[in-house]
């Protein structure tokens, strides 16, 4: 079955923030804050006509 | 530490997943610079599909 | 049009180092991926590793890493491979190979090989 | 790391017979499945690029196809001038293995 759509499941770190229970809530300035700049930090990485977008962000202790 | 855990919709056969990997890690230094996010433990797979009910790019 | 000329064939004793240039002409060197394989006589093809010009990002297979570097000069328009303690298993032609652009996963330009000999 | 199995490691055949190569990769390549040629003496040249995407200038007597882990080269009528050896490349993941090749003959 090709749906002419491509996904990557993608992990990473952020070393210099600290987690605390409001990632675990979309609706606080925090998340929100953090998913924005994840959002605008991948569409400058993948620049090219390729990337269709990013879904499912998920935060974690690290 | 914070762990991040998303997924990236791609057109077919426009990257594969080592160009993936590598293009986010060469970013790393500007996300500092820029985001002030200090990153660090990238790891990049590819997604069988369908692999969840709620995959949507965007 | 787009031409890679390697240089010439190489004998070399145990234990000595050599380097192999591949000149680029006919396209702007700095947005090409270039590729390095091996051809040991009447083997098949084994990748080593690449460059990108533009960042002199490299990578290379595993089990190159401590065998090949991987260098390019851009304002000659050549990258370079040199091979470290060159051992009898290390005789073979060796071929640089450009990357297509853009979301282009393959090897669409080559050049002629370079045959490093290695013997005492 | 992907290994890549190719088979058969040599073959022979007559001239306008239809000729079959597989390709076997350890894990899904996505398509990322390039197929060369070499001629004795000389570097190789790309075939086919994306599994089934023939590069300018390749006659179309060759097509490649393929998903997932298995992929093929055919030869639908063998000409004198396709004695070669014919090499699979993963292009999904690094290291960026090739089969171990395919060797083509005329009987």
């Known amino acids: 079955l090709s749906t002419g759509v491509s996904f990557f499941f993608l992990s990473f770190h952020i070393s210099n923030l600290q987690f605390n229970s409001s990632l675990e809530d979309p609706s606080t300035d925090y998340y929100q804050e953090l998913q924005r700049d994840i959002s605008e930090m991948f569409l400058q990485i993948y620049k090219q006509g390729g990337f269709l977008g990013l879904s499912n962000i998920k935060f974690r202790p690290g | 530490s914070v762990v991040v855990q998303l997924t990236l919709a791609f057109r077919e056969g426009t990257i594969n997943v080592h160009d993936v990997e590598t293009q986010f890690n060469q970013y790393k230094t500007e996300a500092a610079s820029r985001y002030n996010l200090t990153i660090s433990d990238v790891s990049v797979s590819d997604v069988p599909f369908p692999f969840s009910a709620q995959s949507g790019a965007g | 049009q787009v031409q890679l000329v390697q240089s010439g064939a190489e004998v070399k004793k145990p234990g000595a180092s050599v380097k192999v240039s591949c000149k680029a002409s006919?396209?702007?060197?700095?947005?090409?991926?270039m590729h390095w394989i091996k051809q040991a006589p009447g083997q098949g093809l084994e990748w080593i590793g690449y460059?990108?010009?533009?960042?002199?990002?490299?990578h290379y297979n595993q089990k190159f890493k401590d065998k090949a570097t991987l260098t390019a000069d851009k304002s000659a328009s050549t990258a370079y491979m040199e091979l470290s303690s060159l051992r009898s298993e290390d005789t073979a032609v060796y071929y640089c190979?450009?990357?297509?652009?853009?979301?282009?996963?393959?090897?669409?330009?080559w050049g002629q090989g370079t045959l490093v000999t290695v013997s005492s | 790391d992907i290994q890549m199995t190719q088979s058969p490691s040599s073959l022979s055949a007559s001239v306008g017979d239809r000729v079959t190569i597989t390709c076997r990769a350890s894990?899904?390549?996505?398509?990322?499945l390039v197929w060369y040629q070499q001629k004795p003496g000389k570097s190789p040249k790309l075939l086919v690029y994306?599994?089934?995407t023939l590069t300018d200038g390749v006659p179309s007597r060759f097509s490649g196809s393929g998903s997932g882990t298995q992929y093929s080269l055919t030869i639908s009528s063998l000409q004198p001038e396709d004695v070669a050896t014919y090499y699979c490349?993963?292009?999904?993941?690094?290291?960026?293995?090739f089969g171990s090749g395919t060797k083509l003959e005329i009987k």
């Open positions: 190979a450009r990357q297509g652009n853009y979301a282009a996963y393959y090897f669409d330009y």
């Open positions: 006919g396209y702007t060197f700095t947005t090409y991926t």
């Open positions: 460059i990108n010009p533009g960042s002199d990002y490299t």
């Open positions: 894990g899904n390549i996505h398509n990322f």
């Open positions: 994306n599994a089934k």
């Open positions: 490349q993963n292009f999904w993941n690094v290291p960026f293995t």
